[in-house]
């Protein structure tokens, strides 16, 4: 039995005390204006469509429509009792975008189109978004409009972030297959792109894909393997969007940063965080270029955005996303280093500069502070009981450090009789000494290790 809860009050004249569905007249299969309840709220009837007359004689308006008298007053039971006719008007007045990619003046028109579609045994039209198709619902006063500064940065820089893919040849068939991919960013309108050296190598064909899907063969112009920076070039007609390099030396701990990359065609991956340490005594990471500083951030850097830019909120590049060390700690090559590389690369290509040798042992390390030691101790139960020294994050294969027996998670506490408080101490000794007699804390043992640095090109 139908309830009368849906009826207008006071009750329309002539309504039964109790609704009896059996007394409801049969209804056509399709109603142009959609279904509605009769004046008594008992029977489902065909509602009048938008723009049709409504009121006591004409019957109710269809779903989502309301009966409005010429003065714009919704037709109540009182109006109907005066037998004053109104017009069916859509309760919603804003445009909507339908799943058929058409923009409808209001929700009611979309519903009418959906009913017509179903009558023709086609899929119903559903609402995809408020507002016209292809147009965002931008309310300049909305919170998301005001406060999505990260999205604003991404929108600004994304066109200059590229997807890089490397191809190799199969040995006999010589067919090319993809072997690796990474990201990069455009630094000159004529097609110079900066990426990580580990993303590209001379043995491979390098393909670059722009945000718009255009693909180009790239030539490797210059590589600094130790700093892990590479410069590649595409030939493009017209001007390309570029990213400007900011001053990494002016970065402050706590600044918002955005790491962006293009791990797949036509898609960007975005992570965000803050600067944890501005110029992490880069020597500390023990990367081959011992006099280089790194930016430490908690923005996640992974294979997807490796080689892509780390930017500040002005959209300036303040680093190249380069490596993830452990959960929550990632590093980027500072933009000041990129500037230096680009300047030197320009000089090298102009006059072929001589390069001085550097000493290298092959570890990535960081200074151990009491807070860092506590954090590591919480993470690894067998972490040594030390609060200072140089903590080894990684031992690079086929290096003097590996040959000497250094291992990941070791803490260097002294070299050649001098105590080691920070990773800088290790870097300084490497520069000066040809043999390093180290005391290393491993678990809760002290181990003697000898490492002989090798000379390499910077």
């Amino acid at each position: 039995q139908l309830s009368r809860a849906g009826r207008s009050a006071p009750l329309a004249a002539g309504c039964p005390d109790r609704c009896e569905p059996a007394r409801c007249p049969p209804q056509p299969e399709h109603c142009e204006g959609g279904r509605a309840r009769d004046a008594c709220g008992c029977c489902e009837v065909c509602g009048a469509p938008e723009g049709a007359a409504c009121g006591l004689q004409e019957g109710p308006c269809g779903e989502g429509l309301q009966c409005v008298v010429p003065f714009g007053v919704p037709a109540s039971a009182t109006v109907r009792r005066r037998a004053q006719a109104g017009l069916c008007v859509c309760a919603s007045s804003e445009p909507v975008c339908g799943s058929d990619a058409n923009t409808y003046a209001n929700l009611c028109q979309l519903r009418a189109a959906s009913r017509r579609s179903e009558r023709l045994h086609r899929p119903p039209v559903i609402v995809l978004q408020r507002g016209a198709c292809g147009q965002g619902q931008e309310d300049p006063n909305s919170l998301r409009h005001k406060y999505n500064f990260i999205a604003d940065v991404v929108e600004k820089i994304a066109p200059a972030v590229v997807h890089i893919e490397l191809f190799r040849k199969l040995p006999f068939s010589k067919r090319e297959v993809p072997v690796a991919s990474g990201s990069g960013f455009i630094v000159s309108e004529d097609g110079l792109i900066v990426t990580n050296a580990h993303v590209v190598t001379n043995k491979h064909r390098v393909k670059v894909e722009l945000k718009n899907g255009a693909t180009y063969e790239a030539k490797i112009k210059d590589v600094d393997e130790k700093a892990d920076i590479a410069l590649i070039k595409i030939d493009h007609q017209g001007k390309l969007p570029v990213l400007l390099l900011g001053r990494s030396s002016e970065l402050r701990p706590g600044e918002f940063v955005v790491a962006i990359g293009s791990p797949f065609s036509l898609q960007n991956t975005v992570t965000t965080g803050i600067v944890s340490t501005t110029q992490r005594g880069g020597k500390e990471l023990g990367l081959r270029n011992s006099d280089m500083d790194y930016i430490q951030t908690d923005a996640i850097i992974n294979y997807g955005n490796s080689g892509g830019p780390l930017v500040n909120l002005d959209g300036e590049v303040i680093g190249i996303n380069t490596l993830k060390v452990t959960a929550g700690i990632s590093f980027a090559i500072p933009s000041d280093k990129i500037k230096k590389f680009l300047t030197e690369s320009h000089d090298r290509q102009a006059k072929g500069k001589a390069i001085t040798k550097k000493k290298y042992i092959g570890i990535r390390m960081m200074s151990l502070t009491s807070s860092k030691a506590k954090e590591l101790k919480d993470r690894h139960r067998d972490f040594p009981d030390v609060i200072s020294g140089a903590y080894i994050i990684e031992v690079i294969p086929d290096t003097p450090a590996e040959a000497g027996g250094l291992k990941e998670n070791d803490v260097i506490i002294s070299i050649n009789g001098q105590s080691v408080v920070s990773a800088n101490d290790v870097s300084d000794v490497i520069k000066r000494e040809s043999t390093l007699n180290m005391v290393v804390r491993r678990g809760n043992e002290d181990i003697m290790i000898t490492v002989i640095p090798e000379e390499i090109d910077p």
Epitope: R168, P171, F172, S173, V179, A180, T201
Partner: antibody, heavy 123, light 105 residues
Amino acid sequence: QVQLVQSGAEVKKPGASVKVSCKASGYTFTDYEMHWVRQAPGQRLEWMGAIDPETGGTAYNQKFKGRVTITADKSASTAYMELSSLRSEDTAVYYCTREGYSYEGGGYYFDYWGQGTLVTVSS
Amino acid sequence: DIQMTQSPSSLSASVGDRVTITCSVSSSVSYMYWYQQKPGKAPKLLIYDTSNLASGVPSRFSGSGSGTDFTFTISSLQPEDIATYYCQQWYSYPTFGQGTKLEIK
């Protein structure tokens, strides 16, 4: 993980043919060439030939040219090696092995191997 | 065709010994590869691109050399290292050395 699973041991008469299969899993079958290497008792490993599963292109060791046919079925991720006109000196363990590739140096080697199929040729 | 000469063809050593195997080729090659094969098993890659350790291989194994002369070394022999070792080059097509059978004294 990458796995290459070969068909079982075979005993053949001289003059006959043998067809050994190798089912690959754990990687994109068409991104690597599949090679066949054999090892006669007490002998060194001997490369027989290879196939690019995507195109069906093959390369053979001249020593076996005309007697060996390598094929691949992309849809089944399976490679086959057929050796005809068998003689007693073809008694060996036959291995399928995937061509590996060094990203750093650009060199080629064999990184994954099947368990081997013993083919005995005896009258 | 490139000729490969691996030596010695067999050797006996004690646990903890340093073991060296050499491989010479008739023409200069870019890289050498080294495999270990245990009885009844398929070969297993140990060293690629002359000196790089394959994934999961203990650091006591190493490789060196260039051009026509290459060396494979086990710094401290372990009982589980008993096997036959093969060098392999890939010039116009892959060829293997005749193998070195390693036994424990």
